[in-house]
Amino acid sequence: ECGHISVSAPIVHLGDPITASCIIKQNCSHLDPEPQILWRLGAELQPGGRQQRLSDGTQESIITLPHLNHTQAFLSCALNWGNSLQILDQVELRAGYPPAIPHNLSCLMNLTTSSLICQWEPGPETHLPTSFTLKSFKSRGNCQTQGDSILDCVPKDGQSHCSIPRKHLLLYQNMGIWVQAENALGTSMSPQLCLDPMDVVKLEPPMLRTMDPSPEAAPPQAGCLQLSWEPWQPGLHINQKCELRHKPQRGEASWALVGPLPLEALQYELCGLLPATAYTLQIRCIRWPLPGHWSDWSPSLELRTTERAPTHHHHHHHH
């Protein structure tokens, strides 16, 4: 090859200057002995190249691009060859930003998959290949002293979440967790979380059911609904509080919230509703009084209140 480009840096901050040099070897005898080296960025010719013959007979052209405003472009040096440009060499230039500090790192413990799932917001586009790594360690205390490191968790390309499997977790013991972002222009780290995986447990919601009418039980009062729920078995031993929400199926009414209910109530009579009206109901629960995350809302249960005008307007539950 007759020409070779070298650049001050192939990757720079967007808008920064970049200097490049193109050297043509002397033994390219078929070339004009005093060739004029031209520069092109993408499809555009770039003026301002300073050319000189070096002591060994090679020709060198140096150009400074004052602002690289393209996130990706090819810089080439070329010679006029008849009616066309003969490209001697080209390099890919990249421009972008160092990674911002990842923010809003949060984690959930999923007892079904036995994994701690952490997610974060990566921040603005860097325009450069940027890797994210979820880093963590075990700690006996409040994460001021670092215990055993845990294997790095690397998300799939483009994802901003990662799962730490059970074998790397210690329940009822704190872990230090943070995200490290890295690209060619720098490294940044999120603030560190210090958490016990059980304190971020997210339970599955109970399953709402219609209460089976029993011969000795009184039928629901007018404007009331009788319902029961089946707790999520794997979370049965975790103390929880729950809340119901309900709204008429027709119309634009917003959800009305009822709670807190103890998970153990298992059945409930909801009163103060419109008579002869179909309602949609859902339930969700959270570990309590210890820390945790609310479960998702349960699948909906649809029930209809009785025809007669309501006589009571209160909530109470039966054990």
């Epitope: 998959t113 036995s114 707790p231 078995q233 031993h237 109530a265």
Partner: antibody, heavy 118, light 107 residues
Amino acid sequence: EVQLLESGGGLVQPGGSLRLSCAASGFTFSLYWMGWVRQAPGKGLEWVSSISSSGGVTPYADSVKGRFTISRDNSKNTLYLQMNSLRAEDTAVYYCAKLGELGQFMRWGQGTLVTVSS
Amino acid sequence: DIQMTQSPSSLSASVGDRVTITCRASQGISSYLNWYQQKPGKAPKLLIYYASNLQNGVPSRFSGSGSGTDFTLTISSLQPEDFATYYCQQSIGYPGSFGGGTKVEIK
């Protein structure tokens, strides 16, 4: 330190009744599920029953359903097992246990022997 | 109901040996598997819960692994005080069930 102390075991005739108690100390009793596990002489462990922290949920093993009743008194930090219609096959050491959030039997009492024999 | 099958039912080993006990559930139980140690005339003692979490105060030579239906308790270097009977137990739902036990004896 967590302590669980069972009492109430002894010799009883088939068809008879017995009430086991378990006095708990060293932890906030009202926050934990509790349970009974038994072990027949020379045999393995068999879960009998458990009770939720406030007493609202009480699952039983099929072998004792309808005959045994588990209960608790959170004001007295005490767990109970009322055993009626006792059979020879109920002869075992009965252990009281404190459960963890993942259903594990975290701490066990020393056990009380129940012998059903004529 | 979920059945728990432990193997072997007994084994002979020497101090310093690596010992492995397996437990199989009749259906998937995620990680809801606990291991207990019981010595003659004594109450059982929790060793490992949720498949791999070491209970406080239990020596680190005990470890647990597995998920779904197949689980393992490993004692990396058997000590004289480890000769006992070991039980697995599933805790994903009721009725609760224990394995039949594995008696670890001195060779």
